[in-house]
Interface confidence: medium
């Protein structure tokens, strides 16, 4: 992996990539953009999927956290031969199918979609794309759009969560490299630490959850801290404060010494969760300690 900033968030990341005829001579730039970005998401709990669309949508690589499968998926991505129309909605449809299936299986993992396209969508195709993006959102996804060359920023702002979720690349495909850092910064939601990481059994505490991207939620009122206790019961708590780099949350009262609470964060009122390897444990505290 190359150096520089990385994302430690555990969520499901979908790349939805335009492989219509208009990108025929620029597929290498798209591929290298995805490859470099993919290598920056390094949590072992992060899963990734590659979806391409032209006249139909195809899932090149289903959701996986297996780094070898991701490497093979990138190889398949490099071999793609662009051609056909810009049926972006077909790409979103493939993502929604996977999100829907994962939800049905009981995996309520947060989903982030990064959709890349060039050119303007004709009215009915835009209609379907907006609708399918809304369907993905309805299933809990956060949607970002990358527009290259002749894109329509107003259209992409309606397909993405907001205008702030659109990354315009006005200087052509070669400029894609220049937005990797800003995409990473905006799309990364990560939990890095909890303070304190050890709490007293039977007592109430506030926990500061350190991380990034907590204000990327469409509505910060829907952010929740979630504590998965001893791998069984999950308790959700509304934070007292939501900042981009930290949350201030009431911790659940854990009655026994040695209990473990795995920390998760929901950006959508518990519909889905960002996972982490951050654990809060209980210890015995004598009076006055």
């Amino acid at each position: 992996e190359d150096g520089g900033p990385a994302c430690y968030g555990g969520f499901d990341l979908y790349f939805i990539l335009d492989k219509s005829g208009s990108v025929l001579h620029h597929w290498n730039e798209i591929y290298y953009f995805v490859e470099q970005l993919a290598h920056k998401f390094i949590s072992p709990q992060l899963r990734m999927s590659f979806i391409v669309f032209s006249t139909r949508g195809t899932t090149l690589m289903k959701l996986t956290e297996d780094r070898e499968q991701i490497r093979q998926g990138l190889e398949e991505l490099q071999k793609v031969l662009p051609g056909g129309d810009t049926y972006m909605h077909e790409g979103f449809e493939r993502a929604s199918e996977q999100i829907y299936y994962e939800n049905r299986q009981g995996y309520r993992t947060a989903s982030v979609i990064i959709a890349l396209t060039d050119g303007e969508l004709h009215e009915d195709l835009f209609f379907y794309s907006e609708r399918e993006a809304n369907r993905s959102r309805d299933l809990g996804a956060i949607v970002y759009c990358v527009g290259v060359k002749d894109f329509n920023e107003t259209q992409l702002a309606r397909i993405a969560d907001s205008k702030d979720h659109v990354f315009p690349v006005n200087d052509g495909f070669q400029a894609l490299q220049g937005i990797i850092h800003s995409i990473l910064k905006k799309s990364c939601i990560e939990i890095l630490a909890a303070e304190p990481s050890t709490i007293c059994a039977g007592e109430s505490f506030q926990v500061v959850v350190r991380g990034n991207g907590f204000r990327h939620a469409r509505n910060v009122d829907r952010v929740l801290c979630s504590f998965k206790i001893n791998d069984s019961v999950t308790l959700n708590e509304k934070p007292f404060s939501v900042e981009d780099t930290y949350l201030l949350c009431p911790a659940p009262i854990l009655k026994e010494v040695g209990m473990k609470a795995a920390l998760q964060v929901s950006m959508n009122d518990g519909l889905s969760f960002i996972s982490s390897s951050v654990i809060i444990t209980t210890t015995h505290c004598s009076d006055g300690s």
């Epitope: 449809e93 199918e97 009215e123 209609f127 907006e130 609708r131 809304n134 369907r135 959102r137 309805d138």
Partner: antibody
Amino acid sequence: EVQLQESGPGLVKPSETLSLTCTVTGDSISSDYWNWVRQAPGQRLEWMGYISYSGNTYTNPSLKSRITINRDTSKNQFSLQLNSVTPEDTAVYYCARYKTITSAFDVWGQGTTVTVSS
Amino acid sequence: EIVMTQSPATLSVSPGERATLSCRASQNIRDFLHWYQQKPGQAPRLLIYYASQSISGIPARFSGSGSGTDFTLTISSLEPEDFAVYYCQNGHSFPYTFGGGTKVEIK
């Protein structure tokens, strides 16, 4: 509260043009999609077409080139024109809002009856 | 175009009983299926969207299920105001099409 109200003549002669207007209150036609749906006596509902928040239209191919949907954002109204009508176009005409978040028609006008007869 | 077929055409049920209405699409429409209620002289009213998602203000006795081509609207315990015609709608692809309706009448 969002309300839609259809208006226009209740009787149109065959081969003439049917013209209806839908006035929207409580929402702006510069957002979402604004539709016409009709229901002939004893028949199922038929989607006719929409005009989008940006002014683009999409219509049911079964109506071929007979249908035109326009809008007047200053009055927050959109309209339907159906050319070369026949008695088969006799129906209750509804305007309805469509939101892509539900992909459904979530608000409807109360409907206006149009009879095509000489 | 996608053809929507509803059955039965008429359903006779007593108040308090359960009513089950069916809708079939001529091709896979995933869960882009919506249910509407229409009373005489009134416009249709959206009851259920995306096959099973409830609309705020609609009583909990109305529920929907299904995916792909086969869908069901269930009214768990019929109230007098529920006797009406119910339509399903394909929301998947243009042109949007409706079923022929199921009339729920008092037995």
